[in-house]
């Protein structure tokens, strides 16, 4: 009788993560009697996957009834495959021995490759807000995919970006891989409603890429423009001065009125109006009793936006002139060493 051969007909098997892998193995003879064992890898560090004789292997089932006398089919199924299961599997025939069974013949091996989907891309932006004209970096990460080949693209409002760098790790062979990409985006004043999208395409996704998004509203800060104007009121001795705070984002804003450098009133932006581009407008007014002042009054509208250094705009109120003849536009004045002029 010809000597027993162990036949593994499949050189490689490709399985999607979560599915069941079938590893085929047949022996050409029943003899010598002895069990079959399956191993992942070869050599002294090989991992026992299934032992026909003993042990508990909850993920493994035999294709045929392994206890049947004339069984020569030693194929197995491994359930709920993960990328960690990738490797070369060997079907090994043992002959009975004492005290232990003795390895008799091994199959040529079957390489199990696992196709694993990438995780949903996670896009993260800078820790602090930035103003228009600045360049900010966004990162995109996706993990756990296999095989290594993957495509990543960046978009801003549907327009593909080109300024980005991508790495796939590890560089060598691995059961699964991760991708990390950093894109640079130049902010504009119109970006409150903008989105940055990271798109990942992989063989496991069947042409339906995964997307991760970041809203630029989380990243951008649009500083306000200030305009102070004076309107006459019916009462001879009263003047209404308004401070228009325009095109700012986010909403967090505190306004302080100063009369000749002294705080008159502080208020927080509440009932704002929203512009189409997502920025906000707000207006505050101050009713000034002219008769209470002997000299000219310098009125300053000082705005602290989103925790940034205050900006201000001033208006000179001529007490000697009649309120109705007062001009409505004045030049901005610096009201402190740490404040900025807004034109």
């Amino acid at each position: 009788e010809e000597e027993l051969q162990v036949i593994q007909p499949d050189k490689s098997v490709l399985v999607a993560a979560g599915e069941t892998a079938t590893l085929r193995c047949t022996a050409t003879s029943l003899i010598p009697v002895g069990p079959i064992q399956w191993f992942r890898g070869a050599g002294p560090g090989r991992e026992l996957i299934y032992n026909q004789k003993e042990g508990h292997f909850p993920r493994v089932t035999t294709v045929s009834e392994s206890t049947k006398r004339k069984n020569m089919d030693f194929s197995i199924r491994i359930g709920n495959i993960t990328p960690a299961d990738a490797g070369t599997y060997y079907c090994v025939k043992f002959r009975k021995g004492s005290p232990d069974d003795v390895e008799f013949k091994s199959g040529a091996g079957t390489e199990l490759s696992v196709r694993a989907k990438p995780s949903a891309p996670v896009v993260s932006g800078p820790a602090a807000r930035a103003t228009p004209q600045h360049t900010v970096s966004f990162t995109c990460e996706s993990h756990g995919f296999s095989p290594r080949d993957i495509t990543l693209k960046w978009f801003k409002n549907g327009n593909e970006l080109s300024d980005f760098q991508t790495n796939v790790d590890p560089v060598g062979e691995s059961v699964s891989y991760s991708i990390h990409s950093t894109a640079k985006v130049v902010l504009t004043r119109e970006d409150v409603h903008s989105q940055v999208i990271c798109e990942v395409a992989h063989v496991t996704l069947q042409g339906d890429p995964l997307r991760g998004t970041a809203n630029l509203s989380e990243t951008i800060r649009v500083p306000p423009t200030l305009e102070v104007t004076q309107q006459p009121v019916r009462a001879e001795n009263q003047v209404n001065v308004t401070c228009q705070v325009r095109k700012f984002y986010p909403q967090r804003l505190q306004l302080t009125w100063l009369e000749n450098g002294n705080v008159s009133r502080t208020e927080t932006a509440s009932t704002v109006t929203e512009n189409k581009d997502g920025t906000y407008n707000w207006m505050s007014w101050l009713l000034v009793n002219v008769s209470a002042h002997r000299d000219d009054v310098k009125l300053t509208c000082q705005v602290e936006h989103d925790g940034q250094p205050a900006v201000s705009k001033s208006h000179d109120l001529k007490v000697s002139a009649h309120p109705k003849e007062q001009g409505s536009n004045t030049a901005a004045e610096n009201t402190g060493s740490n404040e900025r002029n807004i034109y």
Partner: antibody, heavy 120, light 107 residues
Framework: QVQLVQSGAEVKKPGASVKVSCKAS????????IVWVRQAPGQGLEWMGW????????NYAQKLQGRVTMTTDTSTSTAYMELRSLRSDDTAVYYC?????????????WGRGTLVTVSS | DIQMTQSPSSVSASVGDRVTITCRAS??????LAWYQQKPGKAPKLLIY???NLQSGVPSRFSGSGSGTDFTLTISSLQPEDFATYYC?????????FGGGTKVEIK
């Protein structure tokens, strides 16, 4: 046909040795192990030991260790069991059997048995 | 060593009866249990291997079940030729051990 043919009955004196043969035919001898089982009169079955016909490896029952030797001759497809320093309680029918289990041990082919009587 | 305990040691039954013999292992032996039938002056004959597999040529009235430590041999309808002694045997590891036997006698 597939069979195991054992040597004839033996009468031995205490302290002597006995060698029982078991000739296989009809199958590939080296593909299967051989076990020896004995049965004293009116008693149950007692396993004595196992030998691999492929490699000659053996495993003996602890109580017989040092007194029993099992061998094979692959050229004649014959297994042998020698028991030394015989005692009266070694009187039994000695069976050889072929192991058939792939992973485990069970015995699907038996010889007819050899009666060994130990008496002074 | 793995001890094999068979019960009952003897049973009286009539032709057509259903007979059940049990065998308990002192430790888990998976499915590696065999049942043999032995008639006076004859060698044992393998009936069941791997706990539940019927040996080729054995009538289907014989069946085996169990796993781990508790096993059963059932003769669904006793026939005249079934009066004999039955032995269980664990084949999981050396030393191989047999149960004490169950004698099935005519009532």
């Amino acid at each position: 046909q597939v069979q195991l043919v054992q040597s004839g009955a033996e009468v031995k004196k205490p302290g002597a040795s006995v060698k029982v043969s078991c000739k296989a035919s009809g199958y590939t001898f080296t593909g299967y192990g051989i076990v020896w089982v004995r049965q004293a009169p009116g008693q149950g079955l007692e396993w004595m030991g196992w030998i691999s016909a492929y490699a000659g490896e053996t495993n003996y029952a602890q109580k017989l260790q040092g007194r029993v030797t099992m061998t094979t001759d692959t050229s004649t497809s014959t297994a042998y069991m020698e028991l030394r320093s015989l005692r009266s309680d070694d009187t039994a029918v000695y069976y050889c059997a072929r192991e058939a289990g792939s992973s485990w041990y069970d015995f699907d082919l038996w010889g007819r048995g050899t009666l060994v009587t130990v008496s002074s | 060593d793995i001890q094999m305990t068979q019960s009952p040691s003897s049973v009286s039954a009539s032709v057509g009866d259903r007979v059940t013999i049990t065998c308990r292992a002192s430790q888990g032996i998976s499915s590696w249990l065999a049942w043999y039938q032995q008639k006076p002056g004859k060698a044992p004959k393998l009936l069941i291997y791997a706990a539940s597999n019927l040996q080729s040529g054995v009538p289907s009235r014989f069946s085996g079940s169990g796993s781990g430590t508790d096993f059963t041999l059932t003769i669904s309808s006793l026939q005249p030729e079934d009066f004999a002694t039955y032995y269980c045997q664990q084949g999981a590891s050396f030393p191989i051990t047999f149960g004490g036997g169950t004698k099935v006698e005519i009532k």
